[in-house]
């Protein structure tokens, strides 16, 4: 019996009846055994077939068998109702071997030419299964030359039998206070050969409640308790189960905060499994009663362990625990059924007594001493000498606990001194110095510190003066002795002020002319404004209209008089402004260097002389009356002039203050 090729030789070839293509002889029997590699099968088809036809192919035949199974018995040329010829059919071995038997009987009625067939090994696709047959693999089947392998979906692992997918269903821990868990794939059939462990682990104080929901279907047995697949529930106190069958188990109140659920399946069956909805309970806390003027959120029927509530106060009320304010309040229910902190109060917001207003006063509008939410107070400034800056002085106690103006400001209003008030009524031109009366020049400041000089009060804590008058003290501001509120230079009755800082114009160069001869002194304390101490106004933009040539300004000071001594009493002189070109020309003759008079200066005095400021008046203000506001303002600062004061054809030279308004404002706002 020819065996034909065997693996590992190439498995393919040709088979033919003896004598083919001639007729075959009688009484022939020939057998071929073909063997393919493992995982392969054999394919056979006929290119020629001509055998004697007989009933059920009893005389001559070709028989194909694979193992114990006969695949076909073939004869004739074409198939009939009871006999089969191969025609164009292809035959496949069931495994990796195929037996072919050819037999002819003792006679042929006519010559038959037999058969010719071709065979070859081909890969078996193990992944294709006939309808109704169990699939090769649980999840995914992968064919390859000579074999196949199985793989599993995510969340599964291939069992050691290499075909079944076991669920990776252990180690899941549920920590929420409620939730759902189910058998893998629920409500589809659960996987075979799996062992699942689920844990519910809640904080101590909680008790887990298990409810089986929807459907329950776990493989069972009529006589033995859950021998195949089963569900078990374990707590630190007891074990529940095993459960199987089709009946939903009853609710399980575990009285435990930890539960372990075990689900084990075998290799067979087709069941949908189970679903559990779990909840938890704990000892409830006392129901929170909101304090007056407050409310609780969230509102719940009951509050148990870990539940919390917050208190929110109505507008105008604040959370207080005794005297201590809280921005927020949240209490948490503890395992022993008590809240972790006591209820606060919602107390009406109290803005407290309003701050005192320097140079002003406060009046309670709502009621005497009422400082709670929506209470109104009215600030006002001391009349005559102070005026309120920016706001109207009305403040309301707002919900944030701050007194707040109608403009939303939480800071105090400012009582700003009224500037430019004087007791003096201007008369006509007066030739020669006059003695000042009380209240005539309340801005006048006497500066002592090496030499005698003057200055003018600005606001209530600044003095405007000449740079040359305080140059020596620029680094030792505290050496300046500043006096105000007096007419007599040597009087012991005056208001003392001390300097905190001296600011000399950066464009001023000492001993090199008097351009930019301007300085500011910051006082270390505010002075109290009254009829004898009042600041001078700074010039408005429109001030130039009151400072034209021949307009009268007034200079005051304790400087040298005609007698050559410093004045004991404050003196003043009314002098007209001199045309700038005329003044420039007056100081272009020797001994004055060219360009002595700059655009930052103005000149005042009489051509005939006799009225002038002099040494000791330096830094004092040359003031003008603004007839629109009826306030005095500083137009010039006593700076320099001829060696002989009041000399004919020479004039007093003053720093032109209007040119320095930005400089003054910047320093005052910065410091």
């Amino acid at each position: 019996t020819p065996l034909g090729p065997k693996w590992p030789e190439p498995v393919f070839g040709r088979l033919a009846s003896p004598g083919f293509p001639g007729e075959y002889a009688n009484d022939q029997e020939r057998r071929w055994t073909l063997t393919a590699p493992p995982g392969y099968r054999l394919r056979l088809y006929f290119t020629h077939f001509d055998l004697e036809l007989s009933h059920l192919c009893e005389y001559d035949f070709v028989k194909l068998s694979s193992g114990a199974k006969v695949l076909a018995t073939l004869c004739g040329q074409e198939s009939t109702d009871t006999e089969r010829a191969p025609g164009k059919d292809t035959f496949y071995s069931l495994g990796s071997s195929l037996d072919i038997t050819f037999r002819s009987d003792y006679s042929n009625e006519k010559p038959f030419t037999g058969f010719e067939a071709f065979y070859a090994a081909e890969d078996i696709d193990e992944c294709q299964v006939a309808p109704g047959e169990a699939p090769t693999c649980d999840h995914h089947c992968h064919n390859h030359l000579g074999g196949f392998y199985c793989s599993c979906r995510a969340g599964y692992v291939l069992h050691r039998n290499k075909r079944t997918c076991s669920a990776l269903c252990s180690g899941q821990v549920f920590t929420q206070r409620s939730g759902e868990l189910s058998s893998p794939e629920y409500p589809r059939p659960y996987p075979k050969l799996s062992s699942c462990t689920y844990s519910i682990s809640l904080e101590e104080g909680f008790s887990v409640i298990l409810d089986f929901v929807e459907s329950f279907d776990v493989e069972t047995h009529p006589e033995t308790l859950c021998p195949y697949d089963f569900l078990k529930i374990q707590t630190d106190r007891e074990e529940h189960g095993p459960f199987c069958g089709k009946t939903l188990p009853h609710r399980i109140e575990t009285k435990s905060n930890t539960v372990t659920i075990t689900f084990v399946t075998d290799e067979s069956g087709d069941h949908t499994g189970w679903k559990i909805h779990y909840t938890s309970t704990a000892q409830p806390c006392p129901y929170p009663m909101a304090p007056p003027n407050g409310h609780v959120s969230p509102v719940q029927a009951k509050y148990i362990l870990k539940d919390s509530f917050s208190i929110f106060c109505e507008t105008g009320y604040e959370l207080l625990q005794g005297h201590l304010p809280l921005k927020s309040f949240t209490a948490v229910c503890q395992k022993d059924g008590s809240w972790d902190r006591p209820m606060p109060a919602c107390s009406i917001v109290d803005c407290g007594p309003p701050d005192d207003l320097p140079s002003g006063r406060v009046e309670y509008i709502t009621g005497p001493g009422v400082t709670t939410y929506k209470a109104v107070i009215q600030y006002s400034c001391e009349e005559t000498f102070y005026t309120m800056k920016v706001n109207d002085g009305k403040y309301v106690c707002e919900a944030d606990g701050f007194w707040t103006s109608s403009k939303g400001e939480k800071s105090l209003p400012v009582c700003e001194p009224v500037c430019g008030l004087s007791a003096r009524t201007t008369g006509g031109r007066i030739y020669g110095g006059q003695k000042a009366k009380p209240g005539d020049f309340p801005w006048q400041v006497l500066i002592l510190g090496g030499t005698t000089a003057a200055g003018a009060l600005l606001y209530d804590n600044w003095v405007l003066t000449a740079a040359h008058a305080v140059y020596e003290q620029k680094h030792d501001a505290s050496a300046l002795d500043i006096r105000m509120g007096t007419l007599k230079r040597l009087s012991p009755h005056y208001t003392q002020a001390w300097s905190e800082a001296v600011f000399i114009h950066e464009g001023y160069t000492h001993d090199a002319g008097f351009d930019n001869d301007i300085a500011l002194i910051k006082l270390n304390n505010k002075v109290v404004i009254n009829s004898n101490i009042t600041p001078i106004c700074l010039p408005r933009k429109e001030a130039e209209s009151f400072m034209r040539t021949d307009d009268i300004g007034t200079a005051s000071g304790w400087g040298l008089t005609q007698r050559g001594f410093l004045a004991r009493n404050l003196m003043y002189v009314d002098i007209p402004i001199v045309d700038h070109q005329k003044c420039t020309a007056a100081y272009e003759k020797p001994p004055y260097p060219r360009g002595s008079v700059t655009a930052n200066m103005l000149c005042a005095g009489l051509e005939s002389g006799g009225k002038d400021s002099c040494r000791g008046d330096s830094g004092g203000a040359l003031v003008f009356l603004d007839s629109e506001t009826e306030r005095w303002f500083v137009g010039g600062i006593v700076s320099w002039g001829s060696m002989n004061c009041g000399e004919a054809g020479q004039y007093g030279v003053y720093t032109k203050v209007i040119n320095y308004i930005p400089w003054i404002e910047n320093i005052i706002s910065d410091f």
Epitope: G322, L324, S328, R341
Partner: antibody, heavy 115, light 107 residues
Framework: DVQLQESGPGLVKPSQSLSLTCTVT?????????WNWIRQFPGNKLEWMGY???????SYNPSLKSRISITRDTSKNQFFLQLNSVTTEDTATYYC????????WGQGTSVTVSS | DIVMTQSQKFMSTSVGDRVSVTCKAS??????VAWYQQKPGQSPKALIY???YRFSGVPDRFTGSGSGTDFTLTISNVQSEDLAEYFC?????????FGSGTKLEIK
């Protein structure tokens, strides 16, 4: 963790002002609570001086009201104590603290008032 | 001002004993009372707030009770590390005030 740290001069002359800083880490002073200054005199007597709340409002011990000021710098998460016109009676260890349900104290800073 | 009176300046006890420190307010302070423990060279450490609420990390042998004007700090099973001075404090109204302190001595 919330931490409070006091800082300032250990010696102040009578009639001068005492200025202390409390630097807070781990919690914003605008988030909640009242931020207090407390002092402990030799002999261990404790005195509450005042607080500045999360909103910036202040409350002072009436016995100190004319001399005390508590302010804050929210950008630096600091609050400050200024006590004016000090005398030898103000010699103490000064603490900054949050009181009530969140209770943290600084380590304290010793201040001596002496000429 | 509300005066918080701790009448006992010193208390002597043994390890394992139970001891009660008392504090009396001169007027009603509701439950707005805190208790502090201060060891030498350290800043005060809060034990109890709102009369009976224990701060986290405070051993449960420390318990507070009382309301209105009478308050008690109880230490059950006293330990050697409890040697300290104990202060009560009211925060019901301005000014907040402290008791004068009770020193606990271990026999």
């Amino acid at each position: 963790d919330v931490q409070l740290q006091e800082s300032g001069p250990g010696l102040v002359k009578p009639s001068q002002s005492l200025s202390l800083t409390c630097t807070v880490t781990g919690y914003s002073i605008t988030s909640d609570y009242a931020w207090n200054w407390i002092r402990q005199f030799p002999g261990n007597k404790l005195e509450w001086m005042g607080y500045i709340s999360y909103s910036g409002r202040t409350s002072y011990n009436p016995s100190l009201k004319s001399r005390i000021s508590i302010t804050r710098d929210t950008s630096k998460n600091q609050f400050f104590l200024q006590l004016n016109s000090v005398t030898t009676e103000d010699t103490a260890t000064y603490y900054c603290a949050i009181l009530y349900a969140m209770n943290f104290w600084g380590q304290g800073t010793s201040v001596t008032v002496s000429s | 001002d509300i005066v918080m009176t701790q009448s006992q300046k010193f208390m002597s006890t043994s390890v394992g004993d139970r001891v009660s420190v008392t504090c009396k307010a001169s007027q009603n302070v509701d439950t707005n009372v805190a208790w502090y423990q201060q060891k030498p060279g350290q800043s005060p450490k809060a034990l109890i707030y709102s009369a009976s609420y224990r701060f986290s990390g405070v051993p449960d042998r420390f318990t507070g009770s009382g309301s209105g004007t009478d308050f008690t700090l109880t230490i059950s099973n006293v330990q050697s590390e409890d040697l300290a001075e104990y202060f009560c404090q009211q925060y019901n109204s301005n000014p907040l005030t402290f008791g004068s302190g009770t020193k606990l001595e271990i026999k």
